[in-house]
Protein backbone atom coordinates (compact mmCIF):
# COMPACT_ATOMS: atom_id res chain seq x y z
CA UNK A 1 0.00 0.00 0.00
CA UNK A 2 1.34 3.46 -0.81
CA UNK A 3 2.04 6.10 1.80
CA UNK A 4 -0.43 8.94 1.42
CA UNK A 5 -1.12 12.44 2.66
CA UNK A 6 -4.58 13.92 2.23
CA UNK A 7 -5.65 17.50 2.94
CA UNK A 8 -9.32 18.40 3.22
CA UNK A 9 -9.85 22.20 3.45
CA UNK A 10 -13.33 23.64 3.93
CA UNK A 11 -14.46 27.28 3.84
CA UNK A 12 -18.01 28.57 4.26
CA UNK A 13 -20.14 31.45 3.04
CA UNK A 14 -23.37 32.78 4.49
CA UNK A 15 -25.79 34.78 2.33
CA UNK A 16 -22.99 35.47 -0.17
CA UNK A 17 -20.50 36.59 2.48
CA UNK A 18 -17.39 34.42 2.89
CA UNK A 19 -16.78 33.49 6.52
CA UNK A 20 -13.38 34.22 8.08
CA UNK A 21 -12.80 30.75 9.51
CA UNK A 22 -11.64 27.60 7.77
CA UNK A 23 -11.20 23.97 8.70
CA UNK A 24 -8.52 21.58 7.47
CA UNK A 25 -8.34 17.88 8.21
CA UNK A 26 -5.15 16.04 7.33
CA UNK A 27 -5.01 12.25 6.97
CA UNK A 28 -1.71 10.39 6.94
CA UNK A 29 -1.83 6.85 5.52
CA UNK A 30 -5.61 6.97 5.86
CA UNK A 31 -5.49 7.87 9.55
CA UNK A 32 -6.79 11.17 11.01
CA UNK A 33 -3.58 13.06 11.65
CA UNK A 34 -4.07 16.81 12.04
CA UNK A 35 -7.03 19.09 12.48
CA UNK A 36 -6.43 22.77 11.80
CA UNK A 37 -8.44 25.94 12.01
CA UNK A 38 -7.24 29.53 11.53
CA UNK A 39 -5.88 29.58 15.07
CA UNK A 40 -3.73 26.45 15.06
CA UNK A 41 -3.22 22.85 14.04
CA UNK A 42 -3.58 20.08 16.58
CA UNK A 43 -2.66 16.42 16.40
CA UNK A 44 -5.92 14.66 15.71
CA UNK A 45 -5.62 10.95 16.51
CA UNK A 46 -6.50 9.91 20.03
CA UNK A 47 -4.99 7.15 22.11
CA UNK A 48 -1.58 5.64 22.61
CA UNK A 49 -0.49 5.83 18.96
CA UNK A 50 -0.72 9.62 18.92
CA UNK A 51 1.19 9.96 22.17
CA UNK A 52 3.88 7.45 21.27
CA UNK A 53 4.49 8.59 17.73
CA UNK A 54 3.63 12.26 17.66
CA UNK A 55 4.97 13.14 21.10
CA UNK A 56 4.72 16.80 22.06
CA UNK A 57 5.44 18.09 18.57
CA UNK A 58 4.17 21.57 17.77
CA UNK A 59 2.58 22.22 14.39
CA UNK A 60 3.53 25.89 13.84
CA UNK A 61 4.75 25.35 10.28
CA UNK A 62 1.67 23.37 9.31
CA UNK A 63 -0.56 26.04 10.90
CA UNK A 64 1.20 28.76 8.89
CA UNK A 65 1.06 26.88 5.58
CA UNK A 66 -2.51 25.73 5.95
CA UNK A 67 -3.69 29.17 7.08
CA UNK A 68 -2.32 30.47 3.75
CA UNK A 69 -4.19 27.73 1.92
CA UNK A 70 -7.36 28.61 3.80
CA UNK A 71 -7.06 32.26 2.72
CA UNK A 72 -6.58 31.17 -0.91
CA UNK A 73 -9.66 28.99 -0.75
CA UNK A 74 -11.72 31.80 0.80
CA UNK A 75 -10.71 34.06 -2.10
CA UNK A 76 -11.74 31.32 -4.53
CA UNK A 77 -15.13 30.97 -2.86
CA UNK A 78 -15.66 34.75 -3.06
CA UNK A 79 -15.26 34.54 -6.86
CA UNK A 80 -17.94 31.90 -7.28
CA UNK A 81 -20.89 33.75 -8.78
CA UNK A 82 -23.37 31.11 -7.73
CA UNK A 83 -23.73 32.46 -4.18
CA UNK A 84 -27.34 32.15 -3.09
CA UNK A 85 -28.93 32.76 0.29
CA UNK A 86 -28.02 30.58 3.19
CA UNK A 87 -24.98 28.48 3.94
CA UNK A 88 -22.60 27.24 1.22
CA UNK A 89 -19.30 25.39 1.38
CA UNK A 90 -16.25 25.09 -0.82
CA UNK A 91 -13.97 22.14 -0.22
CA UNK A 92 -10.55 21.48 -1.65
CA UNK A 93 -9.16 17.98 -1.26
CA UNK A 94 -5.53 17.35 -2.09
CA UNK A 95 -3.99 13.90 -2.10
CA UNK A 96 -0.46 12.76 -2.78
CA UNK A 97 0.95 9.24 -2.68
CA UNK A 98 4.35 7.61 -2.70
CA UNK A 99 4.24 4.02 -3.94
CA UNK A 100 6.61 1.18 -3.12
CA UNK A 101 8.42 1.64 -6.42
CA UNK A 102 8.90 5.35 -5.49
CA UNK A 103 6.44 6.50 -8.15
CA UNK A 104 4.15 9.34 -7.08
CA UNK A 105 0.53 10.41 -7.64
CA UNK A 106 -1.04 13.75 -6.78
CA UNK A 107 -4.48 15.17 -7.34
CA UNK A 108 -6.67 18.08 -6.30
CA UNK A 109 -10.47 18.13 -6.15
CA UNK A 110 -12.97 20.94 -5.58
CA UNK A 111 -16.44 20.42 -4.11
CA UNK A 112 -19.21 23.01 -3.84
CA UNK A 113 -21.92 22.17 -1.28
CA UNK A 114 -20.47 18.67 -1.18
CA UNK A 115 -20.68 18.11 -4.94
CA UNK A 116 -17.52 17.49 -6.96
CA UNK A 117 -17.17 20.02 -9.80
CA UNK A 118 -13.47 20.15 -10.68
CA UNK A 119 -10.44 17.84 -10.44
CA UNK A 120 -6.81 18.24 -11.42
CA UNK A 121 -4.03 15.73 -11.83
CA UNK A 122 -1.20 17.72 -10.22
CA UNK A 123 1.45 15.81 -12.14
CA UNK A 124 0.05 16.21 -15.65
CA UNK A 125 -1.77 19.51 -14.81
CA UNK A 126 -4.81 17.99 -16.54
CA UNK A 127 -8.23 19.26 -15.43
CA UNK A 128 -11.42 17.16 -15.48
CA UNK A 129 -15.00 18.01 -14.53
CA UNK A 130 -18.33 16.19 -14.28
CA UNK A 131 -20.85 16.51 -17.11
CA UNK A 132 -23.61 18.32 -15.21
CA UNK A 133 -24.23 21.92 -16.28
CA UNK A 134 -23.97 23.21 -12.69
CA UNK A 135 -20.58 21.55 -12.25
CA UNK A 136 -19.38 22.92 -15.58
CA UNK A 137 -20.45 26.47 -14.64
CA UNK A 138 -18.72 26.27 -11.26
CA UNK A 139 -15.61 24.78 -12.86
CA UNK A 140 -15.36 27.57 -15.45
CA UNK A 141 -15.80 30.12 -12.66
CA UNK A 142 -13.00 28.72 -10.54
CA UNK A 143 -10.62 28.03 -13.43
CA UNK A 144 -11.05 31.56 -14.75
CA UNK A 145 -10.27 32.93 -11.30
CA UNK A 146 -7.15 30.79 -11.02
CA UNK A 147 -6.01 31.89 -14.48
CA UNK A 148 -6.58 35.57 -13.64
CA UNK A 149 -4.42 35.24 -10.57
CA UNK A 150 -1.39 33.96 -12.43
CA UNK A 151 0.90 34.68 -9.51
CA UNK A 152 -1.12 32.46 -7.22
CA UNK A 153 -1.37 29.78 -9.85
CA UNK A 154 2.42 29.68 -10.09
CA UNK A 155 3.26 29.99 -6.43
CA UNK A 156 0.52 28.01 -4.78
CA UNK A 157 -1.36 25.61 -7.01
CA UNK A 158 1.57 24.76 -9.25
CA UNK A 159 3.72 23.97 -6.21
CA UNK A 160 1.12 21.92 -4.37
CA UNK A 161 2.24 18.64 -5.86
CA UNK A 162 5.83 19.19 -4.73
CA UNK A 163 4.76 20.61 -1.34
CA UNK A 164 2.50 17.69 -0.54
CA UNK A 165 5.15 15.13 -1.44
CA UNK A 166 7.79 17.09 0.44
CA UNK A 167 5.61 17.08 3.57
CA UNK A 168 4.84 13.40 3.21
CA UNK A 169 8.54 12.56 2.83
CA UNK A 170 9.31 14.73 5.86
CA UNK A 171 6.76 12.86 7.97
CA UNK A 172 8.11 9.54 6.78
CA UNK A 173 11.67 10.54 7.58
CA UNK A 174 10.82 11.90 11.02
CA UNK A 175 9.22 8.60 12.01
CA UNK A 176 5.75 10.01 12.42
CA UNK A 177 4.51 7.26 10.11
CA UNK A 178 5.26 3.86 11.50
CA UNK A 179 4.32 0.80 9.50
CA UNK A 180 2.92 -0.63 12.68
CA UNK A 181 0.65 -3.65 12.98
CA UNK A 182 -1.98 -3.93 15.67
CA UNK A 183 -3.79 -7.29 15.66
CA UNK A 184 -7.56 -7.30 16.04
CA UNK A 185 -9.59 -8.39 19.01
CA UNK A 186 -12.18 -10.82 17.63
CA UNK A 187 -15.40 -11.79 19.34
CA UNK A 188 -18.36 -13.83 18.20
CA UNK A 189 -21.91 -13.28 19.41
CA UNK A 190 -25.19 -15.01 18.64
CA UNK A 191 -28.68 -13.63 18.48
CA UNK A 192 -32.13 -15.05 17.85
CA UNK A 193 -33.21 -14.52 14.25
CA UNK A 194 -36.30 -16.67 13.66
CA UNK A 195 -37.73 -20.06 14.50
CA UNK A 196 -34.91 -22.59 14.43
CA UNK A 197 -32.34 -20.08 13.18
CA UNK A 198 -29.78 -17.86 14.86
CA UNK A 199 -27.68 -15.01 13.54
CA UNK A 200 -24.01 -15.21 14.41
CA UNK A 201 -21.93 -12.05 14.26
CA UNK A 202 -18.15 -11.88 14.25
CA UNK A 203 -16.63 -8.54 15.25
CA UNK A 204 -13.00 -7.50 14.80
CA UNK A 205 -11.83 -4.32 16.49
CA UNK A 206 -8.70 -2.39 17.36
CA UNK A 207 -6.71 -3.46 14.32
CA UNK A 208 -4.25 -1.59 12.05
CA UNK A 209 -3.77 -1.34 9.12
CA UNK A 210 -7.35 -1.47 7.86
CA UNK A 211 -6.97 -4.41 5.41
CA UNK A 212 -8.62 -7.46 6.95
CA UNK A 213 -10.30 -10.68 5.86
CA UNK A 214 -13.25 -11.66 7.99
CA UNK A 215 -15.61 -14.41 6.87
CA UNK A 216 -17.72 -17.31 8.03
CA UNK A 217 -16.81 -20.92 7.22
CA UNK A 218 -18.85 -24.10 7.50
CA UNK A 219 -16.75 -27.19 8.20
CA UNK A 220 -13.72 -25.23 6.99
CA UNK A 221 -15.23 -24.10 3.67
CA UNK A 222 -16.02 -20.39 3.13
CA UNK A 223 -19.67 -19.45 2.88
CA UNK A 224 -20.58 -17.65 -0.34
CA UNK A 225 -20.67 -13.84 -0.29
CA UNK A 226 -24.43 -13.65 -0.64
CA UNK A 227 -25.00 -15.64 2.55
CA UNK A 228 -22.97 -13.20 4.64
CA UNK A 229 -23.52 -9.58 5.58
CA UNK A 230 -20.48 -7.36 6.08
CA UNK A 231 -20.09 -4.09 7.93
CA UNK A 232 -17.81 -1.38 6.61
CA UNK A 233 -14.27 -1.15 7.95
CA UNK A 234 -14.51 2.00 10.08
CA UNK A 235 -12.10 4.00 12.25
CA UNK A 236 -12.81 3.42 15.92
CA UNK A 237 -11.38 6.73 17.13
CA UNK A 238 -8.19 5.20 18.53
CA UNK A 239 -6.16 5.22 15.34
CA UNK A 240 -7.36 1.67 14.67
CA UNK A 241 -10.28 0.09 12.86
CA UNK A 242 -13.30 -2.13 13.42
CA UNK A 243 -15.63 -4.24 11.28
CA UNK A 244 -18.03 -7.20 11.47
CA UNK A 245 -19.54 -10.04 9.45
CA UNK A 246 -22.78 -11.88 10.14
CA UNK A 247 -24.61 -14.94 8.84
CA UNK A 248 -27.71 -16.94 9.67
CA UNK A 249 -27.36 -20.58 10.67
CA UNK A 250 -29.51 -23.43 12.00
CA UNK A 251 -29.72 -23.62 15.76
CA UNK A 252 -27.88 -26.73 16.93
CA UNK A 253 -25.21 -26.53 14.21
CA UNK A 254 -23.14 -23.80 15.84
CA UNK A 255 -20.08 -26.00 16.39
CA UNK A 256 -19.69 -26.43 12.63
CA UNK A 257 -19.30 -22.73 11.92
CA UNK A 258 -16.20 -20.65 12.53
CA UNK A 259 -15.31 -17.04 11.92
CA UNK A 260 -12.06 -16.85 9.97
CA UNK A 261 -9.89 -13.78 10.45
CA UNK A 262 -6.76 -12.86 8.52
CA UNK A 263 -4.78 -9.70 9.18
CA UNK A 264 -1.20 -8.75 8.26
CA UNK A 265 -0.24 -12.34 7.49
CA UNK A 266 -1.67 -13.76 10.72
CA UNK A 267 -4.88 -15.74 10.91
CA UNK A 268 -7.18 -17.23 13.50
CA UNK A 269 -10.50 -19.05 13.68
CA UNK A 270 -13.19 -18.30 16.22
CA UNK A 271 -16.03 -20.66 17.14
CA UNK A 272 -19.62 -19.71 17.88
CA UNK A 273 -20.16 -19.62 21.65
CA UNK A 274 -22.45 -22.39 22.83
CA UNK A 275 -25.23 -21.97 25.33
CA UNK A 276 -28.03 -19.56 25.83
CA UNK A 277 -28.86 -16.87 23.27
CA UNK A 278 -27.94 -13.60 24.94
CA UNK A 279 -28.58 -10.86 22.40
CA UNK A 280 -32.16 -10.58 21.16
CA UNK A 281 -31.58 -8.67 17.94
CA UNK A 282 -30.52 -9.26 14.37
CA UNK A 283 -28.49 -7.48 11.68
CA UNK A 284 -30.82 -9.11 9.17
CA UNK A 285 -34.04 -7.34 8.28
Amino acid sequence: EPHSLRYNLTVLSWDGSVQSGFLTEVHLDGQPFLRCDRQKCRAKPQGQWAEDVLGNKTWDRETRDLTGNGKDLRMTLAHIKDQKEGLHSLQEIRVCEIHEDNSTRSSQHFYYDGELFLSQNLETKEWTMPQSSRAQTLAMNVRNFLKEDAMKTKTHYHAMHADCLQELRRYLKSGVVLRRTVPPMVNVTRSEASEGNITVTCRASGFYPWNITLSWRQDGVSLSHDTQQWGDVLPDGNGTYQTWVATRICQGEEQRFTCYMEHSGNHSTHPVPSGKVLVLQSHWQ
Epitope: Q218, D219, G220, V221, S222, L223, S224, T227, E262, H267
Partner: antibody, heavy 122, light 106 residues
Framework: QVQLQESGGGLVQPGGSMRLSCGAS????????MNWVRQAPGKGLEWLSY????????YYADSVKGRFTISRDNAKNSLNLQMHSLRDEDTAVYYC???????????????WGQGTTVTVSS | EIVLTQSPSSLSASVGDRVTITCRAS??????LNWYQQKPGKAPKLLIY???SLQSGVPSRFSGSGSGTDFTLTISSLQPEDFATYYC????????FGGGTKLEIK
Protein backbone atom coordinates in the same frame (compact mmCIF):
# COMPACT_ATOMS: atom_id res chain seq x y z
CA GLN B 1 -23.80 -48.07 7.76
CA VAL B 2 -22.74 -44.69 6.35
CA GLN B 3 -22.81 -44.94 2.56
CA LEU B 4 -22.85 -42.96 -0.69
CA GLN B 5 -23.90 -44.56 -3.97
CA GLU B 6 -23.48 -42.87 -7.37
CA SER B 7 -25.64 -43.71 -10.39
CA GLY B 8 -26.45 -42.38 -13.86
CA GLY B 9 -23.11 -42.91 -15.58
CA GLY B 10 -22.73 -44.38 -19.06
CA LEU B 11 -21.87 -43.52 -22.63
CA VAL B 12 -22.79 -40.13 -24.08
CA GLN B 13 -21.89 -38.32 -27.31
CA PRO B 14 -19.85 -35.08 -27.29
CA GLY B 15 -22.18 -32.13 -26.83
CA GLY B 16 -24.71 -34.32 -25.04
CA SER B 17 -26.12 -34.15 -21.52
CA MET B 18 -26.20 -36.51 -18.56
CA ARG B 19 -27.49 -36.42 -14.99
CA LEU B 20 -25.64 -38.15 -12.17
CA SER B 21 -27.20 -38.92 -8.81
CA CYS B 22 -25.75 -39.84 -5.45
CA GLY B 23 -27.91 -41.54 -2.84
CA ALA B 24 -26.98 -41.20 0.84
CA SER B 25 -27.80 -43.58 3.68
CA UNK B 26 -26.78 -44.19 7.28
CA UNK B 27 -26.45 -40.51 8.23
CA UNK B 28 -28.49 -37.30 8.36
CA UNK B 29 -27.85 -36.14 4.81
CA UNK B 30 -29.34 -32.65 5.34
CA UNK B 31 -26.61 -31.81 7.86
CA UNK B 32 -23.69 -32.30 5.48
CA UNK B 33 -22.11 -30.33 2.67
CA MET B 34 -21.39 -32.43 -0.41
CA ASN B 35 -19.04 -32.49 -3.43
CA TRP B 36 -18.50 -34.04 -6.82
CA VAL B 37 -14.95 -35.11 -7.68
CA ARG B 38 -13.81 -36.87 -10.85
CA GLN B 39 -10.83 -38.89 -12.00
CA ALA B 40 -9.96 -39.26 -15.68
CA PRO B 41 -8.37 -42.60 -16.67
CA GLY B 42 -4.81 -42.76 -15.34
CA LYS B 43 -5.03 -39.21 -13.96
CA GLY B 44 -5.35 -37.54 -10.57
CA LEU B 45 -8.38 -36.32 -8.63
CA GLU B 46 -10.17 -33.20 -9.85
CA TRP B 47 -12.65 -31.41 -7.61
CA LEU B 48 -15.70 -30.28 -9.58
CA SER B 49 -18.38 -28.78 -7.34
CA TYR B 50 -19.44 -28.11 -3.76
CA UNK B 51 -22.89 -27.56 -2.24
CA UNK B 52 -23.50 -26.63 1.40
CA UNK B 53 -26.00 -28.46 3.61
CA UNK B 54 -28.82 -26.00 2.87
CA UNK B 55 -27.75 -25.29 -0.75
CA UNK B 56 -26.97 -21.67 0.17
CA UNK B 57 -23.33 -21.90 -0.94
CA UNK B 58 -22.38 -23.49 -4.25
CA TYR B 59 -18.96 -23.52 -5.92
CA TYR B 60 -17.69 -24.89 -9.24
CA ALA B 61 -14.27 -25.57 -10.71
CA ASP B 62 -13.49 -23.32 -13.69
CA SER B 63 -13.38 -26.36 -15.98
CA VAL B 64 -17.11 -27.07 -15.51
CA LYS B 65 -18.54 -23.65 -14.64
CA GLY B 66 -21.53 -22.87 -16.86
CA ARG B 67 -21.85 -26.49 -18.05
CA PHE B 68 -22.47 -28.45 -14.84
CA THR B 69 -25.09 -27.78 -12.15
CA ILE B 70 -25.00 -29.26 -8.66
CA SER B 71 -28.20 -29.64 -6.66
CA ARG B 72 -29.54 -31.62 -3.73
CA ASP B 73 -32.86 -32.84 -2.38
CA ASN B 74 -32.55 -33.23 1.38
CA ALA B 75 -36.00 -34.84 1.62
CA LYS B 76 -34.83 -37.60 -0.73
CA ASN B 77 -31.28 -37.86 0.61
CA SER B 78 -29.97 -37.24 -2.87
CA LEU B 79 -27.23 -35.23 -4.54
CA ASN B 80 -27.30 -34.50 -8.28
CA LEU B 81 -24.94 -33.31 -11.00
CA GLN B 82 -26.53 -32.14 -14.25
CA MET B 83 -23.94 -32.10 -17.03
CA HIS B 84 -24.39 -30.32 -20.38
CA SER B 85 -22.16 -29.73 -23.44
CA LEU B 86 -20.08 -32.77 -22.57
CA ARG B 87 -16.61 -33.08 -24.06
CA ASP B 88 -14.16 -35.94 -24.58
CA GLU B 89 -12.12 -34.65 -21.63
CA ASP B 90 -15.12 -35.12 -19.31
CA THR B 91 -14.60 -38.89 -19.56
CA ALA B 92 -13.87 -40.01 -16.00
CA VAL B 93 -15.03 -41.82 -12.90
CA TYR B 94 -17.29 -39.42 -10.98
CA TYR B 95 -17.36 -39.59 -7.17
CA CYS B 96 -19.65 -37.90 -4.68
CA UNK B 97 -18.01 -37.08 -1.36
CA UNK B 98 -19.23 -35.81 1.99
CA UNK B 99 -17.57 -32.95 3.87
CA UNK B 100 -16.65 -34.01 7.39
CA UNK B 101 -18.39 -32.17 10.22
CA UNK B 102 -15.67 -32.84 12.78
CA UNK B 103 -14.75 -29.79 14.87
CA UNK B 104 -11.71 -28.07 13.41
CA UNK B 105 -12.30 -29.53 9.96
CA UNK B 106 -10.73 -27.81 6.97
CA UNK B 107 -13.08 -28.89 4.21
CA UNK B 108 -11.96 -32.53 4.17
CA UNK B 109 -14.00 -35.32 2.55
CA UNK B 110 -14.54 -38.19 4.98
CA UNK B 111 -17.01 -40.38 3.07
CA TRP B 112 -16.82 -41.21 -0.65
CA GLY B 113 -18.99 -43.20 -3.02
CA GLN B 114 -17.53 -45.98 -5.14
CA GLY B 115 -17.82 -43.86 -8.31
CA THR B 116 -19.77 -44.03 -11.58
CA THR B 117 -18.10 -44.01 -14.99
CA VAL B 118 -18.98 -41.42 -17.62
CA THR B 119 -17.64 -41.99 -21.13
CA VAL B 120 -17.94 -39.17 -23.67
CA SER B 121 -17.30 -40.52 -27.15
CA SER B 122 -18.75 -40.48 -30.63
CA GLU C 1 -7.16 -20.55 -8.16
CA ILE C 2 -4.73 -22.02 -5.68
CA VAL C 3 -2.42 -24.61 -7.26
CA LEU C 4 -1.07 -27.49 -5.17
CA THR C 5 2.17 -29.06 -6.39
CA GLN C 6 3.10 -32.46 -4.99
CA SER C 7 6.57 -33.92 -5.04
CA PRO C 8 7.80 -36.35 -5.93
CA SER C 9 5.21 -37.48 -8.48
CA SER C 10 6.32 -41.06 -7.91
CA LEU C 11 8.47 -42.75 -5.32
CA SER C 12 9.85 -46.26 -4.74
CA ALA C 13 10.36 -47.49 -1.20
CA SER C 14 10.57 -50.65 0.87
CA VAL C 15 8.52 -51.97 3.76
CA GLY C 16 9.79 -50.39 7.00
CA ASP C 17 11.09 -47.24 5.27
CA ARG C 18 10.26 -43.76 6.47
CA VAL C 19 8.63 -41.85 3.60
CA THR C 20 7.93 -38.12 3.20
CA ILE C 21 5.68 -36.58 0.55
CA THR C 22 5.48 -32.82 0.13
CA CYS C 23 2.73 -30.52 -1.06
CA ARG C 24 3.40 -26.88 -1.92
CA ALA C 25 0.63 -24.28 -2.33
CA SER C 26 0.89 -21.38 -4.77
CA UNK C 27 -0.08 -19.02 -1.92
CA UNK C 28 -0.53 -19.31 1.83
CA UNK C 29 -3.40 -21.59 2.79
CA UNK C 30 -2.54 -21.56 6.51
CA UNK C 31 -3.56 -25.03 7.74
CA UNK C 32 -6.44 -25.63 5.31
CA LEU C 33 -4.87 -28.78 3.91
CA ASN C 34 -5.96 -32.43 3.89
CA TRP C 35 -4.31 -35.69 2.78
CA TYR C 36 -5.89 -38.75 1.09
CA GLN C 37 -4.81 -42.24 0.13
CA GLN C 38 -6.19 -43.95 -2.99
CA LYS C 39 -5.67 -47.54 -4.09
CA PRO C 40 -6.30 -48.68 -7.69
CA GLY C 41 -10.01 -49.04 -8.50
CA LYS C 42 -11.04 -47.69 -5.10
CA ALA C 43 -12.34 -44.39 -3.78
CA PRO C 44 -9.93 -42.10 -1.91
CA LYS C 45 -9.68 -42.33 1.88
CA LEU C 46 -9.12 -39.38 4.23
CA LEU C 47 -5.92 -39.64 6.29
CA ILE C 48 -5.14 -36.18 7.67
CA TYR C 49 -7.21 -33.00 8.00
CA UNK C 50 -6.21 -29.49 9.06
CA UNK C 51 -2.59 -30.22 8.02
CA UNK C 52 -1.77 -32.35 11.06
CA SER C 53 -4.92 -33.90 12.61
CA LEU C 54 -5.20 -37.66 12.19
CA GLN C 55 -8.58 -38.86 10.93
CA SER C 56 -10.28 -41.40 13.20
CA GLY C 57 -9.28 -44.98 12.37
CA VAL C 58 -6.09 -44.05 10.52
CA PRO C 59 -2.90 -45.72 11.84
CA SER C 60 -0.59 -43.46 13.84
CA ARG C 61 2.34 -44.14 11.49
CA PHE C 62 0.74 -41.45 9.27
CA SER C 63 1.41 -37.86 10.29
CA GLY C 64 1.08 -34.45 8.69
CA SER C 65 2.86 -31.17 9.28
CA GLY C 66 3.32 -27.73 7.82
CA SER C 67 1.53 -24.42 7.55
CA GLY C 68 1.33 -21.60 5.03
CA THR C 69 2.63 -22.94 1.72
CA ASP C 70 4.70 -26.04 2.58
CA PHE C 71 3.22 -29.27 3.91
CA THR C 72 4.43 -32.84 4.39
CA LEU C 73 2.84 -36.23 4.84
CA THR C 74 5.10 -38.70 6.63
CA ILE C 75 4.73 -42.47 6.92
CA SER C 76 7.07 -43.45 9.73
CA SER C 77 7.39 -47.13 8.84
CA LEU C 78 5.93 -48.33 5.55
CA GLN C 79 3.56 -51.29 5.65
CA PRO C 80 2.61 -53.39 2.60
CA GLU C 81 -0.91 -51.88 2.54
CA ASP C 82 0.51 -48.32 2.28
CA PHE C 83 1.57 -48.67 -1.36
CA ALA C 84 -0.94 -46.38 -3.07
CA THR C 85 -1.32 -42.89 -4.52
CA TYR C 86 -1.49 -39.94 -2.10
CA TYR C 87 -3.22 -36.61 -2.73
CA CYS C 88 -3.26 -33.31 -0.90
CA UNK C 89 -6.33 -31.03 -1.05
CA UNK C 90 -6.97 -27.47 0.11
CA UNK C 91 -10.14 -25.63 1.15
CA UNK C 92 -8.67 -22.20 1.87
CA UNK C 93 -10.07 -20.86 -1.40
CA UNK C 94 -12.84 -23.04 -2.82
CA UNK C 95 -11.28 -26.50 -3.27
CA UNK C 96 -8.45 -28.06 -5.28
CA PHE C 97 -6.37 -31.26 -5.25
CA GLY C 98 -2.68 -31.76 -5.80
CA GLY C 99 -1.47 -33.88 -8.74
CA GLY C 100 -0.78 -36.95 -6.62
CA THR C 101 2.26 -38.98 -5.53
CA LYS C 102 2.41 -42.67 -6.48
CA LEU C 103 4.18 -44.75 -3.85
CA GLU C 104 5.50 -48.03 -5.30
CA ILE C 105 7.34 -51.03 -3.92
CA LYS C 106 11.10 -50.93 -4.56
Amino acid sequence: QVQLQESGGGLVQPGGSMRLSCGASGFTFSRYSMNWVRQAPGKGLEWLSYISSRSSTIYYADSVKGRFTISRDNAKNSLNLQMHSLRDEDTAVYYCARVSDITGNTGSFDIWGQGTTVTVSS
Amino acid sequence: EIVLTQSPSSLSASVGDRVTITCRASQSIHNYLNWYQQKPGKAPKLLIYAASSLQSGVPSRFSGSGSGTDFTLTISSLQPEDFATYYCQQSYSTLTFGGGTKLEIK
